[in-house]
Interface confidence: low
């Protein structure tokens, strides 16, 4: 694959528009320096996108995975 | 619908300038690399050019080094090509398309939503 | 830059026909290849990304396979609306550079 020359976040910009139902998993990155980080693969073509934090589904996704972290 | 659509169309002498334009609507424009690629008459496709989501890399193809400069406008949802010392080779069908990167850097999957096509024709 | 030949030119197939079209690239390029189809006075539309995915809603007839620097599109079963021009590219260094394409053509 070609090769970065210089270090970057992974993701630098964030694609809106992603329904809900089209994402197969979410990975969050936890990478120094970078603003928050969450890839998806998609379910229609097995692509990655990187999604836009502030989407509202994202926000209460997190929301759920963190109250669930705490009540553990 | 996503779509594409090019403008700019022209007769140029050698040596003119044009500039072509791409309005992007349907998708996140700003999220996504731009490219532009042209093919001559009876000929093949020429990959041009591209640029990435905020315009701090940019690509060019040899042929065209120094005489056309890609941009964009993302408010606009909008990519340009400014064509400066055009030659009778230039002569061609400019596409503009969407380059599909994934969330790496090394990630491409190739340009999967293209424009109509503009045609430049450089004759005197 | 990295150069890429097709082959064959043009082909002469019948509806139901497998057609087998090569790419082959003049150093490695691992699997960064995409293939595109091309109908006269149209816009080329993306089959194939990263030589064997197949873009979405693109029949499955198409496939596509090859790694370094061979690349195969196969279209298992012709169909009418598959007659038209191919095209590889790829996407490993600048420039991206494409195939020279091939015609298939009705026999």
């Known amino acids: 694959k070609p090769v970065s020359l210089s270090y970057r976040c992974p993701c630098r910009f964030f694609e809106s528009h992603v329904a809900r139902a089209n994402v197969k998993h979410l990975k969050i990155l936890n990478t120094p320096n970078c603003a928050l980080q969450i890839v998806a693969r998609l379910k229609n073509n097995n692509r990655q996108v990187c999604i836009d934090p502030k989407l509202k589904w994202i926000q209460e996704y997190l929301e759920k995975a963190l109250n669930k972290r705490f009540k553990m | 619908e996503v779509q594409l659509v090019e403008s700019g169309r022209g007769l140029v002498q050698p040596g003119g300038s044009l500039r072509l334009s791409c309005a992007a609507s349907g998708f996140t424009f700003s999220s996504y690399w731009m490219s532009w690629v042209r093919q001559a008459p009876g000929k093949g496709l020429e990959w041009v050019a591209n640029?990435?989501?905020?315009?701090?890399?940019?690509y060019y193809v040899d042929s065209v080094k120094g005489r056309f400069t890609i941009s964009r406008d993302n408010a606009k949802n909008s990519l340009y090509l400014q064509m400066n010392s055009l030659r009778a080779e230039d002569t061609a069908v400019y596409y503009c398309a969407r380059d599909l990167t994934g969330p790496y850097y090394y990630d491409y999957y190739g340009m999967d939503v293209w424009g109509q096509g503009t045609t430049v024709t450089v004759s005197s | 830059a990295i150069r890429m030949t097709q082959s064959p030119s043009s082909v002469s197939a019948s509806v139901g026909d497998r057609v087998t079209i090569t790419c082959r690239a003049s150093?490695?390029?691992?699997?960064?290849l995409a293939w595109y189809q091309q109908t006269p006075g149209k816009a080329p539309k993306l089959l194939i990304y990263d030589a064997s995915s197949l873009e979405s809603g693109v029949p499955s007839r198409f496939s596509g396979s090859g790694s370094g620097t061979d690349f195969t599109l196969t279209i298992s079963s012709l169909q009418p609306e598959d007659f038209a021009t191919y095209y590889c590219q790829q996407f490993n260094s600048y420039p991206r550079t494409f195939g020279q394409g091939t015609k298939v053509e009705i026999k």
């Open positions: 150093q490695g390029i691992s699997s960064a």
């Open positions: 640029m990435n989501q905020d315009g701090s890399e940019k």
